[in-house]
């Protein structure tokens, strides 16, 4: 299987990729020779071989062309070679070797003549056990791979040289490379290609945020001598309207949005809203749908509620209890409240005016959360129209018409207010004379008063009622020395007022008479 070259290696020379002859210098000419061969994947390549194993004193040199250093400080030489076992060649015991030598020479000039003594030895290369088995026919050749480091290199370029001292060897490929920390994106920050130092120190590199992102913490990484990025610090996050996709910040697609900077993903537009363009930070409400000022962008767009339904009025003289049902359509919000608009109208319903400020609403007139209100202190025998508005958080953003239900009523005449005090004028063994004042609010002409009484000890199980035209009465046929309880209420054309509170008076014992005594409860 082909193993791709690591992305952190930059080739300065790769003999496999050179088309045609390599054209390296062989000295002497009958030593290393350029031939056609195959690599470990049976790909045809140009290769150099030498197999002068008969002679004791071999000194065959092969020099590459000049290799530019580029920005490398430390270079790596990867040799793939096949070394023929000396035992497989009869007659050559003693003269055959199984090693060769690797040299280099730095130079600013690429026209340098070959001189052995100018080269510095890198290492003696021997076949080890880390080979790839290559089946050529049924013979297994050992394809060895050896890597050597050279550095620091300072001049503009260098030559490599291979010295054969009597081996049967083929250089299948020569690759010279340096290591870099390759361009990478980490935490949405871009780090450029960086060539490490030759020394053991790490190079600190500042990252730059990818498009459509911003720094959360300043992004940094360290480039090691081995061309590896280490210790990512800090990060960038995608702007509003963009989300992280792989190594980029990608615009939210139409129909999606992202309201704020950060790591969140683009979200689908909430109900009744949409976006037509890429990179939306929020979604626009559809026609006739709205979002309140303080609503988050994630909230669905809503519309005002429909009108309340089934309004029922329950009139009690100059009070009315209004009840209604929840709107059929809430508009998509839960913050529905009701406002009561009160209008006092003439006998022509079109001639209305706002109600007097004296009119009272229980629990209140505006911002009702329940579907009932009691309106009091209305005028008797008056036409009123009540408009019940249903509103929610977006009602004020929509154009009229208002969504309300209306009910018109006419108040009755009000009954009189209670009699406040009852006074005992005279007592006898069988009678009590009482007087009282007219109610503070007669609300019309008092037709008569109803006087209700009973013996205290009988606890209202049996009582007597009598009517008085004026504001006094004498009750007779009572038992002597007995406590009676009295309550009085006034009557007008509108009906009875409420009863007074209870007053207690006693009849006199036998042959005893008292007058002018106030009540006690």
């Amino acid at each position: 299987e082909l193993s791709p070259q690591p992305s952190n290696e930059v080739n300065l020379l790769d003999s496999k990729t050179i088309q045609g002859e390599l054209g390296w210098i062989s000295y002497p000419s009958h030593g290393w020779e350029e031939i056609s061969g195959v690599d470990e994947h049976y790909t045809p390549i140009r290769t150099y071989q030498v197999c002068n194993v008969m002679d004791h004193s071999q000194n065959n040199w092969l020099r590459t062309n000049w290799v530019p250093r580029n920005s490398a400080q430390k270079i790596y030489v990867e040799l793939k070679f096949t070394l023929r076992d000396c035992n497989s060649i009869p007659l050559v015991l003693g003269t055959c070797k199984e090693t060769f030598n690797l040299y280099y020479m730095e130079s600013d000039d690429h026209g340098v003549k070959f001189r052995e003594h100018q080269f510095t030895k890198i290492d003696t290369i021997a076949a080890d056990e880390s080979f790839t088995q290559m089946d050529l026919g049924d013979r297994i050749l050992k394809l060895n791979t050896e890597i050597r480091e050279v550095g620091p290199v300072n001049k503009k370029g260098f030559y490599l040289a291979f010295q054969d001292v009597g081996a049967c060897v083929a250089l299948v490929s020569v690759r010279v490379y340096f290591k870099k920390c390759p361009f990478t994106v980490k935490n949405l920050a871009m780090f450029p290609d960086t060539v490490p130092m030759d020394s053991q120190s790490l190079v600190e590199v500042r990252g730059s945020c990818v498009n459509n992102s911003k720094e959360e913490d300043p992004p940094r990484m360290y480039c090691s001598t081995e061309g590896e990025w280490l210790v990512p610090i800090g990060k960038c996050t995608c702007n509003a309207g963009y989300e992280e996709r792989g190594f980029i910040c990608q615009a939210c697609r139409p129909g999606f949005y992202k309201a704020s900077d950060g790591a969140a993903k683009c979200a689908k537009c909430p109900p009744h809203s949409s976006t037509q363009e890429d990179g939306s930070m929020n979604c626009r409400c559809e026609n006739n749908y709205f979002r309140a000022e303080k609503d988050p962008p994630s909230m669905a767009c809503a519309r005002p509620p429909s009108a309340p339904r089934n309004v029922i009025s329950n009139i009690n003289e100059t009070s009315v209890i209004l009840d209604w049902s929840w709107p059929l359509d809430t508009g998509g919000r839960k913050d529905i409240t009701f406002n009561i608009i009160c209008k006092k109208c003439g006998w022509n319903v079109r001639q209305c005016e706002p109600c007097s400020p004296n009119v009272r609403f229980l629990p209140r007139q505006l911002g009702l959360t329940n579907t009932t209100v009691t309106v009091t202190d209305l005028l008797a025998h008056t036409n009123y129209t009540f408009e019940i508005d249903a509103v929610n958080g977006v009602s004020e953003l929509s154009s009229p018409p208002r969504q309300y239900a209306a009910v018109s009523i006419t108040t009755n005449q009000a009954a009189p207010s209670p009699v406040m005090t009852i006074k005992k004028d005279r007592t006898s063994r069988n009678s009590i004379s009482l007087s009282w004042q007219e109610p503070e609010h007669p609300n019309g002409i008092i037709l008569d008063y109803e006087v209700k009484y009973y013996q205290k000890q009988e606890q209202e199980t049996s009582y007597t009622i009598l009517r008085a035209r004026g504001t006094n009465v004498t009750i007779s046929s009572l038992k002597p020395d007995t406590t009676y309880v009295f309550q009085i209420r006034a009557r007008t054309a509108a009906g009875y007022g409420t009863n007074s509170r209870k007053f207690e008076f006693e009849t006199s014992p036998d042959s005893f008479s008292i007058s002018g005594e106030n009540s006690h409860v």
Epitope: Q49, M54, T82, L91, D138, A170
Partner: antibody
Framework: QVQLLQSGAEVKKPGASVKVPCKAS????????MSWVRQAPGQGLEWMGW????????TYAQGFTGRFVFSLDTSVSTAYLQISSLKAEDTAVYYC??????????????WGQGTLVTVSS | EIVLTQSPATLSVSPGERATLSCRAS??????PAWYQQKPGQAPRLLIY???TRATGIPDRFSASGSGTDFTLTISRVEPEDFAVYYC????????FGQGTKVEIK
């Protein structure tokens, strides 16, 4: 250029000996082994063996031991094949051929023109 | 000793045709054989050796392939000068030749 020069035809009686020379030129004689190949009239090629021109160490193929000897004179870059006790069946063209050793396999890349040895009474 | 058997003994082809020569080993051999061409009255000439490498001056219409026990020499388009006898040769501790295949004009 590289070449191997052999002597002309030899006619020998049975039981006699013959020494066939092979003179190399155009390359370092001691850097390449020399092989000997026999071809009887109308027949195929037979490998007889080879000699290490550096050490003089010979190797003989099966059937070519005893009466056949490979030798050298490196001073004149010449290899020799000596056959003793000649027999009629030794009648053949004898070729010297330079050995081509490579990592990937061997062959004989330069051949002499051949020496016809005829054994006849 | 490994025996190399070449087939066919004679191959008749017309110029411009493809010629395929076979060489079979009696047992699995250590590498691809070398191939030689011999014309009447001439010494053999090395065609291909090692890893199917053509010898110096050999045209690229000659190619070799195979592994194990079965090997092939192919002449992609036979030229008039290619009519000759072809030998395969196996090497190792002991070298052996096949008996040869004669390529003649059809």
């Amino acid at each position: 250029q590289v070449q191997l020069l052999q002597s002309g035809a030899e006619v020998k009686k049975p039981g006699a000996s013959v020494k066939v020379p092979c003179k190399a030129s155009g390359y370092t004689f001691t850097s390449r082994a020399m092989s000997w190949v026999r071809q009887a009239p109308g027949q195929g090629l037979e490998w007889m063996g080879w000699i290490n021109t550096n050490t003089g160490n010979p190797t003989y193929a099966q059937g070519f031991t005893g009466r056949f000897v490979f030798s050298l004179d490196t001073s004149v870059s010449t290899a020799y094949l000596q056959i003793s006790s000649l027999k009629a069946e030794d009648t053949a063209v004898y070729y010297c051929a330079r050995v081509r050793l490579t990592v990937y396999g061997d062959g004989m890349d330069v051949w002499g023109q051949g020496t016809l040895v005829t054994v006849s009474s | 000793e490994i025996v190399l058997t070449q087939s066919p003994a004679t191959l008749s082809v017309s110029p411009g045709e493809r010629a395929t020569l076979s060489c079979r080993a009696s047992q699995s051999v250590s590498s691809n054989p070398a191939w030689y061409q011999q014309k009447p009255g001439q010494a053999p000439r090395l065609l291909i050796y090692g890893l199917s490498t053509r010898a110096t001056g050999i045209p690229d219409r000659f190619s070799a392939s195979g592994s194990g026990t079965d090997f092939t020499l192919t002449i992609s388009r036979v030229e008039p000068e290619d009519f000759a006898v072809y030998y395969c040769q196996q090497y190792g501790p002991s070298w052996t030749f096949g008996q040869g295949t004669k390529v003649e004009i059809k």
